[in-house]
Amino acid sequence: IWELKKDVYVVELDWYPDAPGEMVVLTCDTPEEDGITWTLDQSSEVLGSGKTLTIQVKEFGDAGQYTCHKGGEVLSHSLLLLHKKEDGIWSTDILKDQKEPKNKTFLRCEAKNYSGRFTCWWLTTISTDLTFSVKSSRGSSDPQGVTCGAATLSAERVRGDNKEYEYSVECQEDSACPAAEESLPIEVMVDAVHKLKYENYTSSFFIRDIIKPDPPKNLQLKPLKNSRQVEVSWEYPDTWSTPHSYFSLTFCVQVQGKSKREKKDRVFTDKTSATVICRKNASISVRAQDRYYSSSWSEWASVPCS
Amino acid sequence: RNLPVATPDPGMFPCLHHSQNLLRAVSNMLQKARQTLEFYPCTSEEIDHEDITKDKTSTVEACLPLELTKNESCLNSRETSFITNGSCLASRKTSFMMALCLSSIYEDLKMYQVEFKTMNAKLLMDPKRQIFLDQNMLAVIDELMQALNFNSETVPQKSSLEEPDFYKTKIKLCILLHAFRIRAVTIDRVMSYLNAS
């Protein structure tokens, strides 16, 4: 058993049929010695008396808020949560496996630049009685500070019969140098509590590996005289690290017909313009990627050919 | 990338082209190592990230873009002395910091070159003959060093009398390639920045 926060404790349980429960001794936080009684949750029934209460925690029915009282006055509370371990593996019932980039990916994180700011998100089908708390650091043995905000519900989607909820959090490394070469990964730890179930999820990454630039901005077309060709121009996104001559991007320019089946023409360039043939009803899209470290491509920025 | 890239003209800055070749070569070598050594811990998640140049050179600090010198987190200054006569400077007037920067890059390349050559000698003794260092990568390191044209003492190649542990050597190769790729990215950024200055 360990303390998650003040008056909230996590009991770790081996979750197999013939596992013995965990013996837990609750102590009433009071100088009083006698006349103390214990209750659970909303029930007024006395579960035991005395300054300590020894319980066996085996089921979610044994978890909850234990309260000690004296003469009708509440003395202290202890909320017990359960963390299940099945076949040596901690349960992951609360969050959905996003399966990207690999199986057992519960947390996904992205950074728009090298400033040390990043966003992580996760999915769940649970809509109520759900809380998250996020901590992060650079490295784990001698951790350096990363500050994370509160996790918020960022999207709701309908997937078949189920509703899916996306939560996200923003974090910022306390003293980040955009040019630094990372040798210790960022660690992100999410505590998830659903009713009386506790779970924790972790992700470890280098900022360089989660870079995904914003799409190029100010995408414009300039027709070339007496030609079907157009000059496409764009700019670096505002959120990209500066100076751009140091943090350079490379670009992919794509001409896409109205039908998805039509052949796509693609050109790669390090410049912020390109000359392409603009077909009728086609659209031109441009996306960006770090020029020197191949992390994710940005989403496309698009304009119609007409 | 699977399609032709419109590469910019290296312009006046002769080292830019070499640094681009270097990054391409080390990235290819790392990819080859990860495929060949698929049953070894050779991915970024699995290896320990060691920097053989730590406390010996300070490339990131010495080559920091001017715009980032206001960022206190980037000013992790280290007292390191460097030789300051390089030919990549072309005909430009360059600051002492730029000379320090290129000198630091040269020292990095020299250290990695020694490590890779020592390692290759060990890998050539492996009866499995599983993996060797790409000669192209070693040649590209050499070319960039020559383009930088710094005079510095030659570091003797390390020789080991004991029987090499091939498993450890291959893991060390992965560690070295990961670290060198990160440094090659920094070098490429620096060359691009200097080329634009």
Epitope: D18, L40, F60, G61, Y66 | -
Partner: antibody, heavy 119, light 107 residues
Amino acid sequence: EVQLVQSGAEVKKPGESLKISCQSSGYSFTTYWIGWVRQMPGQGLEWIGIMSPVDSDIRYNPMFRGQVTMSVDKSSSTAYLQWSSLKASDTAMYYCARRRPGQGYFDFWGQGTMVTVSS
Amino acid sequence: EIVLTQSPATLSASPGERATISCRASQSVSSWLAWYQQKPGQAPRSLIYSASNLQSGIPARFSGSGSGTDFTLTISSLEPEDFAVYYCQQYNIYPYTFGQGTRLEIK
């Protein structure tokens, strides 16, 4: 006052189905799991299983798994035990009981439902 | 599963006497053992939990002791209403199991 009131005695033929009930009152129904115990004529007590009234989480005695089904209706604070096809060997007194949280024993019991299966 | 063996199977005693019933487990159940009393035609009633804790409303003449594999239920001075069948039950490991019962009869 805590009370567990069980449905009346049943006489059934082999192969028939049956659902007996246990209605709780006088306490917070969702705080306490409900269990079932069998007592064959002239025999001792046998633990069938327990069930959470919150989310219908169930722990069956392997000996009874597949033979009986436990269920619960939170809105009426009622627990059920049912058989899809009775056998003569199911003849017994069935007790529902309230599981004490933080312990696991049964602190309050229903009066029992006698089930007789005979052709 | 854990087997609980009660002894004796039948105990004859007179009111006012001390009665002791034993319960032995086939493996340790820590202190997670309860005692119940059942009278003819009635449902069982909880007497003792956690091996030695008296259920509220139960007279103090009933007491329990033991831990691990050996447990005892003691009635210090028998009253006429105490003559019944007594069961021990372990609730350490699923499936929870009961002893076969001890009949306490009037001598």
